[in-house]
Interface confidence: low
């Protein structure tokens, strides 16, 4: 009986097709693979980010993949062929791994780069980023941002920078279309007369850095005497009811602070009928049901009762 | 939140080596470099040198170049400083710290290791 | 080596009092645009404490009343009003070239 045995796949790259990050790893099917014609060869591919401790392992019959990385290090990447059980009458055969790495050329030192870097996603409407200049950057050193998403044909640059002193450091961008729920790229690179400027490059989704407009209107309504319902509304925008988190700052007799967080666009508060001031605030911030992670609204405006039966009125802001 | 966890006061004969573990935690640990610094009782600071914890590249002060190894395991984000041919004036306690570019300055320190070399 | 000279070498002041240390460098430190100039904070048994670096930018998380200024060769801190808790050891620190170095530090004690 002779060893079966198969060959690495050959012409393995990771091509970068300019998404600021999104990167194409392909190749091509093993040499010699006339003895297997019958059979469906597949390959196993691990990549990482250099210095990341997990590879991540895909096993495909296809000759590319595609996945984003973090551009502000290398990536390296291995393939090899496997041949299933059913082609060798017996155990898997895998060939060797071929290797490749990807990664650019950083230009200029660390300090030169953007500092800070904010985004937010305003009320799931509006992108806002804004940076620092490196440190000891020049006057004369501008930076540019540009991003990408699946769905552009090509990488895009800002059109409305926020300046400061001539220098941008913000960009307003314009409606995204179909763009939450995928990875959106960035990179800031930077030009200067004197010295060359580190890029950056971020990755994030945007519905994980929504920052939602404060709830609106407040009311007070008495449901018994010992009862208070505390109601509000939701900001105007697309944020969907379900996608809404609370929390609730209450003040009695500007002593007790009760906070609460609640899911609902209403709180029952106990109370005694001693009671001569109420004073609440809420902010809202995108819940785990539509995101991973958000941001805090700002607080609502504070709506107060003082010294009036609250069966006899319901206020409104 | 960040933190780096020192070994615990070693004591040593004038000719042998020590070997100081730092071990970090509540970061991205390849992004950033590891100096050593030491400080003898009563005085001043001196810079040992550094480690990429990326790359492992290593910046040694020439006083300590034939002396000093540093090294780092990323599977366990820790980082340690070799010290050999000891003599009584390298009684110190030793820190870590962690920089980022140069001009970041060490935001972050180790608790410090008292290492007391006497025959 | 780049030689850091710190001055004074102890400094008695009160709380409220305004206080300046000042760090001087055989070489300049300024590099890219850059001063490569950091000032620590150090109690006795605690490791230092970065205030300031890149000449003037303040650490996280330290008071208002800690900043820098300075580029080249010269460089101050300055601590508006001392409090109770700023009475400590102060180095300065350049991190142009390696080796890195400190100067030699100044111990700020209540009058």
């Known amino acids: 009986d002779t060893e079966i045995k198969v060959n690495p796949p050959q012409d393995f790259e990771i091509v970068d097709p300019g998404y600021l990050g999104y990167l194409y790893l392909q190749w091509q099917p093993p040499l010699s693979l006339d003895h297997f014609k019958e059979c469906t060869v597949e390959y196993e591919l691990k990549y990482r980010n250099i210095g990341s401790e997990t590879w991540k392992t895909i096993i495909t019959k296809n000759l590319h993949y595609k996945d984003g990385f973090d551009l502000n290090k290398g990536i390296e990447a291995k393939i090899h062929t496997l041949l299933p059980w059913q082609c060798t009458n017996g155990s898997e055969v895998q060939s060797s791994w071929a290797e490749t790495t990807y990664w650019i050329s950083p230009q200029g030192i660390p300090e030169t780069k953007v500092q800070d870097m904010d985004c937010v996603y305003y009320n799931w409407q509006y992108l806002l980023c804004s940076w620092k200049p490196g440190i000891g950057v020049l006057l004369d050193t501008n930076y540019n941002l540009f991003y990408w998403y699946e769905g552009l044909d090509h990488a895009l640059q800002c059109v409305d920078y926020i300046k400061a002193d001539g220098q941008n450091i913000g960009c307003r961008f314009p409606y995204l279309e179909a763009s939450d729920y995928k990875d959106f790229y960035i990179c800031v690179n930077g030009s200067s007369e004197n010295k060359p400027i580190r890029s950056s490059y971020f990755t994030f989704q945007l519905q994980n850095i929504v920052k939602p407009l404060p709830p609106v209107y407040l009311t007070f309504t008495r449901e018994s005497s010992c009862e208070i319902k505390l109601k509000w509304s939701i900001p105007l925008g697309p944020i969907p009811a379900r996608c809404f988190d609370y929390e609730i700052e209450i003040r009695e007799d500007d002593t007790t602070l009760v906070t609460a967080t609640v899911e609902n666009e209403t709180y029952t508060l106990k109370t005694t009928n001693e009671t001569r001031q109420l004073c609440f605030v809420v902010r809202s911030k995108v819940n785990i049901y539509c995101s991973d992670d958000g941001i805090w609204s700002e607080w609502s405006d504070k709506q107060c009762w003082e010294g009036e039966d609250l069966s006899k009125k319901t206020l409104l802001r | 939140q960040v933190q780096l966890v020192q070994s615990g006061a070693e004591v040593k004969k004038p000719g042998a080596s020590v070997k100081v573990s730092c071990k970090a935690s509540?970061?991205?640990?390849?992004?950033?470099?590891m100096n050593w610094v030491r400080q003898a009782p009563g005085q001043g600071l001196e810079w040992m040198g550094r480690?990429?914890?990326?790359?492992?590249?290593?910046h040694y002060n020439q006083k300590f170049k034939d002396r000093v190894t540093m090294t780092r395991d990323t599977s366990t984000s820790t980082v340690y400083m070799e010290l050999s041919s000891l003599r009584s004036e390298d009684t110190a306690v030793y820190y870590c710290?962690?920089?980022?570019?140069?001009?970041?300055?060490?935001?972050?320190w180790g608790q410090g290791t008292l290492v007391t070399v006497s025959s | 080596d780049i030689v850091l000279t710190q001055s004074p070498s102890s400094l008695s002041a009160s709380v409220g009092d305004r206080a300046t240390i000042t760090c001087r460098a055989s070489?300049?430190?300024?590099?890219?645009?850059?001063?490569?100039m950091n000032w620590f904070q150090q109690k006795p048994g605690k490791p230092p404490k970065l205030l300031i670096y890149?000449?003037?930018r303040q650490g996280s998380g330290d008071p208002a009343r800690f900043s820098g200024s300075g580029s080249g060769t010269d460089f101050t801190l300055t601590i508006s009003s001392l409090q109770p808790e700023d009475f400590a050891t102060y180095f300065c620190?350049?991190?142009?070239?390696?080796?890195?170095?400190f100067g030699g530090g100044t111990k700020l004690e209540i009058k």
């Open positions: 480690i990429d914890a990326y790359a492992g590249e290593t």
């Open positions: 509540g970061y991205t640990f390849t992004n950033y470099w």
């Open positions: 890149a000449a003037s």
């Open positions: 070489e300049s430190v300024d590099n890219y645009g850059i001063s490569f």
């Open positions: 620190q350049q991190s142009k070239e390696v080796p890195w170095t």
């Open positions: 710290a962690r920089g980022y570019g140069d001009a970041y300055g060490m935001d972050h």
